[in-house]
Every structure is written in structure tokens, then in C-alpha cells.
């Protein structure tokens, strides 16, 4: 596991003639943000194919307004790195797409509008743990300068982040079967930990957290024998050395996606990822051009005007898919802290905070007791966003300003008389009744109708109960 990091240094007009017009104007101030998409290997993949290694979106940059008559300068950039975490091994060779997006902040109906300013792509070799690599890419008249690197997250080390290291427990050796971790000779290779519960007899793993099954076994923990001993899905050159997975029937069996679409299972059914030029539930709709308006949810369509040339939809934040048809459920990441309610408004996320919390993500805990005083020796108790006073004896109400009358609720039963007392209340019982609240009748024979005595006590022994 590790993180790919991208640092944007500048985005502005490239050298040479034909400087681009500024993307912002006095009438339409705007700001930039960037998106990076990473794919393993050196393949020339379609722009909308999944970002299998991961993707990231930057923060918004500062608002920029064009100065009339001035050439387009380097535009103000968002702060910070773009970070793309990867869970498995770093592949060493990768493809990237970096998109520069413009957010217009004019008086658009329904919030800001997005449009793609530039897209650059490339294929690179990169070892994890190495220094920052610098790059310059041009897209039309625009130029993007950036640096990138891949780094492993502890305890992973190595050029692919596949070796695990941990500090030595003793200076001299690492323990049975564990080698020193070059170049960190003061650390040892850490044991690989598979998915919890993975069968030690029928399962194995080569990456942390996985569980692959030996031939003849299946299930998430390789505890289910399969009916046939032949390996249906050998991984690698021979099933004997690498094991296999035996899949059961699934919604993608027989590939319901037409026109070269790829099928992926979802909790309820399946989903088709369609090649460019096709869309629909099963990629069955074809021959689409930008003139047909295939991009939903405000997606920007780029492509030829004839049916043979494919189109690409550039989706606004919050939407994805080859036709921007899928809403990204950004609330599923639970961005609102402290029990706040998440609202995905399409153009933005909003958090509705519980009382006592504030901030864009409800991250600030307000001091409920700040500036609140409880009278008559009461103490303020913070909790749940509403202050509460714990009042001294004899006082009540929200701020302990009311003198409490313990007899107001008529606590003495059977006509008993209530007297307020500094320690609470006292009941003077009417003849024939007894108990702290005069709740027990006294029988004529002297015994009282008390509850059944606990083990070891005699019934009718009143002083034991009072």
C-alpha cells in the first residue's frame, strides 16, 4: 500500500504564438481545480476507462478575475498535493490523465458551472520510494508543470511497496524466517497478514488482506469445498504453484453487456461499463454523437459530429460514468462529523450539524456552557449541544433560578402530610399507614402488607424496610 502524490507547479499559457484567452473575466470570475486519474501499465486506454489505480480531485484554487487587456498569466492554483492512495502493489509502470477544470462563479442558475479547460495524458515508469519526478505537458495553447512521486505507507517498503518492514525487536536478529529489510537494515521484514479467518490449510495470500483459494476450495475464506476438483480459474502459469479461484454463477456470467462492454457485479445486479460510442443499461444503444446530447447531468460532450467518431463526456463533480449518468454518492463517505446530516446538493456537499456543533463538516464542538451561568450554586453540564444545569438541593428549572417545592407533586400517599426539609421531604403518615411515602397499610394484627421479604429476612419485620 502507498500513495501517489502529484504537485501542480503552474498552469498557464505555453510558449510560442497563439496565447490562449484567459479562462476568467470580470463578468465571470472563476477558479481552477485539477483531477488526476491513474491506471496501471503502459496501455493506451480510453479516457473514460476506469481509473483502476485510483483518482483524486484537488481543492478549488483562489478566485481569479481577468485584468482587462492583460495577457493570460499563470493562473492561481489550489493549495496542497493531490494524493491517490493505492491499496495493492505499485505497478512500476502507469498511465496518467491530469485534467484542469474551470469553475465559473457568475450568477448561474443552480450554482456554479464547470468546464474542462485542458487534459494531458502520459505513460511513465516510476519506482516507489524514489525522488520527485518533474514533468511538463502541453494541451493546446496551455502548459502544465507538475511533479509526482509514489511512496509506500509503513510498514510497506520497496520499489513496489510489497515488502513489509517493522522495527527489530532485538539488535542482532529478526526472528525465524524474517530477513533484514534492505536498505533499512535496522528493520525486519514483517510477516504477511492475510484476510482475517483465511483458512491456513486451503487458503493463501500474497498481498495483505487477501485470501486466495487452493484448488478445490472456494468462499471468501476458502472454507467451502467445490463439487469439482478441476480448477476453473487458474491464476498464472500453473494452478499447482499459484492456486485458483472457483467462481460461482453470478449476474455477469455470459456477459450481458453488448458491444464490448465490460460487466461488473453490484450488490443487487450488474453494471455495464460501455466503450465509447455506446450507452444504455447493456451498452445496446449505438451510433451516438454529441448532437444527440448523450451527456447527462451537465456533462460536457467532446467528439466528432459523425457516428463513426466517438464522443467523450466530461462530467461535473458529483457525476461519473461514460455518460455522466451515475451520481457519485459523496455522502457514503460520511464526511459530516459528530452526527451531522449530509446533503448532496449536486454542486456541493452540505452538512446540517446537530446542536452544539458547527463548521463545514460539523467538526467544531461549540462550548455549550460558554457564557451560561447556573444560579444558586448549580453547575453547568455540557452535552449533546444543549447546556444543562445540575441544580443544588432545593432549586430547579433550566438555570436553577426556581426554588423547588419538593411537596408540589404530592408525594405522600393515603392522605399523608408532606413537609419540606433541607434534605428533601418528610411524610407524616395518616393512622394505619407507614413507609417513606406512606405507601404500606398497617394490618390490624400489627403485621404490615410489605413486599415479600428478601431471603434471610422475616416478613413483618418493619424496621428492616424503613
Amino acid at each position: 500500500a502507498g500513495v501517489f502524490e502529484l504537485q501542480i507547479h503552474s498552469f498557464g499559457p505555453g510558449p510560442g504564438p497563439g496565447a490562449p484567452r484567459s479562462p476568467c473575466s470580470a463578468r465571470l470570475p472563476c477558479r481552477l481545480f485539477f483531477r488526476v486519474c491513474l491506471k496501471p501499465g503502459l496501455s493506451e486506454e480510453a479516457a473514460e476507462s476506469p481509473c483502476a489505480l485510483g483518482a483524486a480531485l484537488s481543492a478549488r484554487g483562489p478566485v481569479y478575475t481577468e485584468q482587462p487587456g492583460a495577457p493570460a498569466p499563470d493562473l492561481p492554483l489550489p493549495d496542497g498535493l493531490l494524493q491517490v492512495p493505492f491499496r495493492d502493489a505499485w505497478p512500476g509502470t502507469f498511465s496518467f490523465i491530469i485534467e484542469t477544470w474551470r469553475e465559473e462563479l457568475g450568477d448561474q442558475i443552480g450554482g456554479p458551472a464547470w468546464s474542462l479547460l485542458a487534459r494531458v495524458a502520459g505513460r511513465r515508469r516510476l519506482a516507489a520510494g524514489g525522488p520527485w519526478a518533474r514533468d511538463i505537458q502541453r494541451a493546446g495553447a496551455w502548459e502544465l508543470r507538475f511533479s509526482y512521486r509514489a511512496r509506500c505507507e509503513p510498514p510497506a517498503v520497496g520499489t513496489a511497496c510489497t515488502r513489509l518492514c517493522r522495527p527489530r525487536s532485538a539488535p542482532s536478529r529478526c526472528g525465524p524466517g524474517l530477513r533484514p529489510c534492505a536498505p533499512l537494515e535496522d528493520e525486519c521484514e514483517a510477516p504477511l497478514v492475510c484476510r482475517a479467518g483465511c483458512s491456513p490449510e486451503h487458503g493463501f495470500c500474497e498481498q495483505p488482506g487477501e485470501c486466495r483459494c487452493l484448488e478445490g476450495w472456494t468462499g471468501p475464506l476458502c472454507t467451502v469445498p467445490v463439487s469439482t476438483s478441476s480448477c476453473l480459474s487458474p491464476r498464472g502459469p500453473s494452478s499447482a504453484t499459484t492456486g485458483c479461484l472457483v467462481p460461482g454463477p453470478g449476474p455477469c456470467d455470459g456477459n450481458p453487456c453488448a458491444n464490448g462492454g465490460s460487466c461488473s457485479e453490484t450488490p443487487r445486479s450488474f453494471e455495464c461499463t460501455c466503450p465509447r460510442g455506446f450507452y444504455g443499461l447493456r451498452c445496446e444503444v449505438s451510433g451516438v454523437t454529441c448532437a444527440d446530447g448523450p451527456c447527462f447531468n451537465g456533462g460536457l460532450c467532446v467528439g466528432g459530429a459523425d457516428p463513426d467518431s466517438a464522443y467523450i463526456c466530461h462530467c461535473p463533480p458529483g457525476f461519473q460514468g461514460s455518460n455522466c449518468e451515475k451520481r457519485v454518492d459523496r455522502c457514503s463517505l460520511q464526511p459530516c462529523r459528530n452526527g451531522g446530516l449530509c446533503l448532496d446538493l449536486g454542486h456541493a456537499l452540505r452538512c446540517r450539524c446537530r446542536a452544539g456543533f458547527a463548521g463545514p463538516r460539523c467538526e467544531h464542538d461549540l462550548d455549550d456552557c460558554a457564557g451560561r451561568a447556573c444560579a444558586n450554586g448549580g453547575t453547568c453540564v455540557e452535552g449533546g449541544g444543549a447546556h444543562r444545569c445540575s441544580c443544588a438541593l432545593g432549586f430547579g428549572g433550566r438555570d436553577c433560578r426556581e426554588r423547588a417545592d419538593p411537596c408540589a407533586a404530592r408525594p405522600c400517599a393515603h392522605g399523608g402530610r408532606c413537609y419540606a426539609h433541607f434534605s428533601g421531604l418528610v411524610c407524616a403518615c395518616a393512622p394505619g399507614y407507614m413507609g417513606a411515602r406512606c405507601e404500606f397499610p398497617v394490618h390490624p394484627d400489627g403485621a404490615s402488607a410489605l413486599p415479600a421479604a428478601p431471603p434471610g429476612l422475616r416478613p413483618g419485620d418493619p424496621q428492616r424496610y424503613l
Epitope: P176, G177, L178, P191, L192, V193, C194, R195, C198, S199, P200, E201, H202, G203, F204, C205, E206, C211, L214, C222, A240, T241, T242, G243
Partner: nanobody, 127 residues
Framework: EVQLVESGGGLVQPGGSLRLSCAAS????????MGWFRQAPGKEREGVAA????????LYADSVKGRFTISRDNSKNTLYLQMNSLRAEDTAVYYC????????????????????WGQGTLVTVSS
């Protein structure tokens, strides 16, 4: 410290048989994988066969399937490799390996699975 001691290697003609033994001293291995590995001169170490102690699983490299048999005598705390129909390409130093704490990390024919190893015994197949 567990010690694994291999024996039974030697010179044998092609088509012949040998039985290798691996005795585990000071420790009774009651669960986890034990395996046989080999390394021919100038080649990488490769997994030959593995058996799960306390279970019924046995695994073999494709190159030895049908010719080699792995087994274990629990009472003697000894692992065996019966090698039949030997070929010249079976010539190698054969190592016994044991995994003392059963866990799923790595395939049973991957040497990284094992934390204890013997010193090896040489098998030479030649006419």
C-alpha cells in the same frame, strides 16, 4: 529452536527410486504446512511438494505429479518424500521446510511460507 535434518539422498540411475526423510527434533509439529524444496546448480529454489499437518491437503509441483509422494509419520515426527521414476532433471539439493505457526500467508509451494529449514540432502540422478 527446531532442527530439521534431511537424509536419504544419494546417487541413483534414471528410472530409479529414493525415499527422503526429514526428522524434526525438539519440537512436535502438530499443525501447519511442511514441504520439500529443491535447488539445482545455477537455478532458483523451487517447491516440490507440501503437506498440511493436522489436515488432509497435499500439493505437488506439476513437474513431479504422479511420480513423487509426500507423507508424514506423526509418531516419529518425520516427513517423507517418496521419489519414483527419477529423471536427470530431478538432480538437486533437496531441502525440508516447516511452518510452525499455521497461517495462510503465501502459497504452500512458496518458500516464503516457511520459517524453519534443514541443511539439505543431495540427490543425483545419473547413469
Amino acid at each position: 529452536e527446531v532442527q530439521l535434518v534431511e537424509s536419504g539422498g544419494g546417487l541413483v540411475q534414471p528410472g530409479g527410486s529414493l525415499r527422503l526423510s526429514c526428522a524434526a527434533s525438539t519440537y512436535t509439529i502438530s499443525s501447519g504446512y511442511m514441504g520439500w524444496f529443491r535447488q539445482a546448480p545455477g537455478k532458483e529454489r523451487e517447491g516440490v511438494a507440501a503437506i498440511y499437518i493436522g489436515g488432509s491437503t497435499t500439493l505437488y509441483a506439476d513437474s513431479v505429479k504422479g511420480r513423487f509422494t509426500i507423507s508424514r509419520d506423526n509418531s516419529k515426527n518425520t516427513l517423507y518424500l517418496q521419489m519414483n521414476s527419477l529423471r536427470a532433471e530431478d538432480t538437486a539439493v533437496y531441502y525440508c521446510a516447516a511452518q510452525l505457526r499455521p497461517n495462510a500467508a503465501y502459497h504452500p509451494l512458496d518458500g516464503r511460507k516457511y520459517n524453519y529449514w534443514g541443511q539439505g540432502t543431495l540427490v543425483t540422478v545419473s547413469s
